[in-house]
């Protein structure tokens, strides 16, 4: 599949590959994300097309605000159906601060461990969804470098909703979230105008994640 997802005859289509992925989704659950239903709809639309299982794709979810919570580990569920049920039940934990570096670092150090289901030799993918600048951005550069050193592919999503609602400049925020994404940035960074628009990036994000299998 080419970068624009047109079928290229010389490469086997994405679905034919049986390569495994370990995917950890890092969700900003701070108070400013609204409505939370849009986040769960996004998760549903992204996850429902994945082949989830111990020998296929595994998915874990981490939520952060001021603190970090492992919603479920990579090896917790062994089917797409189970993951969808669990993802629907995830509520926003809230928090006045957005500790994005902490969320990413915890995912790297804890969610991607064998104890929590990560598999040796399997490609690691992190999807970070956030709606605001981090309160610990002084740590971001080091945290991202650590992810890079561990070959964790990162997709980052900036939700501009709270900025647009407050008529605030998004420039600094977008730059920060771009810095989280793997290179090339244009293939790994997404921004959406508000939470409701999250579903509009699902298909492109999904194909890009699965292009990593090829």
């Amino acid at each position: 599949v080419s970068p624009t997802f047109q079928v290229v005859n010389s490469i086997a289509p994405v679905q034919e590959c049986s390569t495994q992925l370990d995917i950890v989704i890092v969700l900003d659950g701070s108070n400013s994300i609204y409505p939370w239903d849009s986040v769960t709809a996004f998760l549903n639309d992204l996850l429902e097309r994945m082949d989830i299982g111990p020998k296929q794709t595994q998915v874990g979810i981490v939520q952060y605000g001021e603190n970090v919570t492992h919603e479920f580990n990579l090896n917790k569920y062994s089917s797409t159906e189970e993951v969808l049920v669990a993802a629907k039940k995830i509520g926003r934990r809230g928090g006045l601060q957005t500790m994005t570096a902490l969320g990413i670092d915890t995912a790297r150090k804890e969610a991607f461990t064998e104890a929590r289901g990560a598999r040796r030799g399997v490609k690691k993918v992190m999807v970070i969804v956030t709606d605001g600048e981090s309160h610990d951005n002084h740590r971001l550069k080091k945290v991202i470098q650590d992810c890079e050193d561990e070959n964790i592919q990162r997709f980052s999503i900036a939700i501009l909703g709270s900025y647009n609602r407050g008529n605030l400049s998004t420039e600094k925020f977008v730059e920060e979230i771009k810095s989280i994404a793997s290179e090339p940035t244009e293939k790994h960074f997404f921004n959406v105008s508000d939470e409701l628009a999250l579903v509009t990036i699902v298909k492109t994000l999904g194909e890009r994640i699965f292009a990593l299998e090829a």
């Epitope: 599949v1 624009t4 997802f5 047109q6 079928v7 289509p13 994405v14 679905q15 034919e16 639309d45 429902e48 097309r49 082949d51 989830i52 299982g53 089917s79 797409t80 159906e81 244009e186 960074f189 997404f190 921004n191 579903v199 509009t200 990036i201 699902v202 298909k203 492109t204 999904g206 194909e207 699965f210």
Partner: antibody, heavy 120, light 113 residues
């Protein structure tokens, strides 16, 4: 080459159920999503939903929720679409169709269609 | 859900003439970060299943004659047949695959004048 061969025409009474099959060949059946699209006589195309033959996962259009069931038998590379509580306006040609990619639903390969007539 | 509206509903064109069919979506199907429009065009002849002509709004499927072309962006799209041939008599449908559920236009019937 990819081929989707559907079961033959059916005549059903209102309130009954119909199960249409779609046998796939020429590719790895579990590797690609199968979609179902219907077309009432003289009308346009209506997407009904998809099944992931690998996991059995499904996504149904809201209009058909509760009435449609999509299943598959991987041992014979066949997908099925069952529609229950049939009404006269379910009279249509039902197509199975295969997508090229996992998330993008443009449909390159189509079955020949199965005419389902609902009449008392 | 995204609603797709085609115009005209039917048209009659002389052989060799250029013809255009329009399709409008109720919301944008443009993925702006890479300029991809999630739109496909199909041709359906009587008694046959639809045939994919174009995807990404303008990418011609392999084997489709180059007299067929697609254009447009966002919410407004056009299928153009540069020189109508007798075998082009059919119903043409647009389809968006930007958001689930994917949806089709109501169809445009093309006949020979």
């Amino acid at each position: 080459q990819v081929q989707l061969v559907q079961s033959g025409a059916e005549v059903k009474k209102p309130g009954a159920s119909v199960k249409v099959s779609c046998k796939a060949s020429g590719y790895t059946f579990t590797g690609y999503f199968m979609h179902w699209v219907r077309q009432a006589p003289g009308q346009g195309l209506e997407w009904m939903g998809w099944i992931n033959p690998n996991s059995g996962g499904t996504n149904y259009a809201q209009k058909f929720q509760g009435r449609v069931t999509m299943t598959r038998d991987t041992s014979i590379s066949t997908a099925y679409m069952e529609l229950s509580r049939l009404r006269s306006d379910d009279t249509a040609v039902y197509y199975c169709a295969r997508s090229v990619l996992r998330y993008f639903d443009w449909l390159l390969w189509w079955g020949q269609g199965t005419l389902v007539t609902v009449s008392s | 859900d995204i609603v797709m509206t085609q115009s005209p509903e039917s048209l009659a064109v002389s052989l060799g003439e250029r013809t255009t069919i329009n399709c409008k979506s109720s919301q944008s199907v443009l993925f702006s970060s890479n300029n991809e429009n999630h739109l496909a065009w199909y041709q359906q002849k009587p008694g046959q299943p639809p045939k994919l002509l174009i995807y990404w709004a303008s990418t011609r499927e392999s084997g489709v004659p180059d007299r067929f072309s697609g254009s447009g962006s966002g919410t407004d799209f056009t299928l153009t047949i540069s020189s109508l041939q007798a075998e082009d008599v059919a119903v043409y449908y647009c389809q968006q695959y930007y958001i689930t559920p994917c949806s089709f236009g109501q169809g445009t019937k093309l006949e020979i004048k």
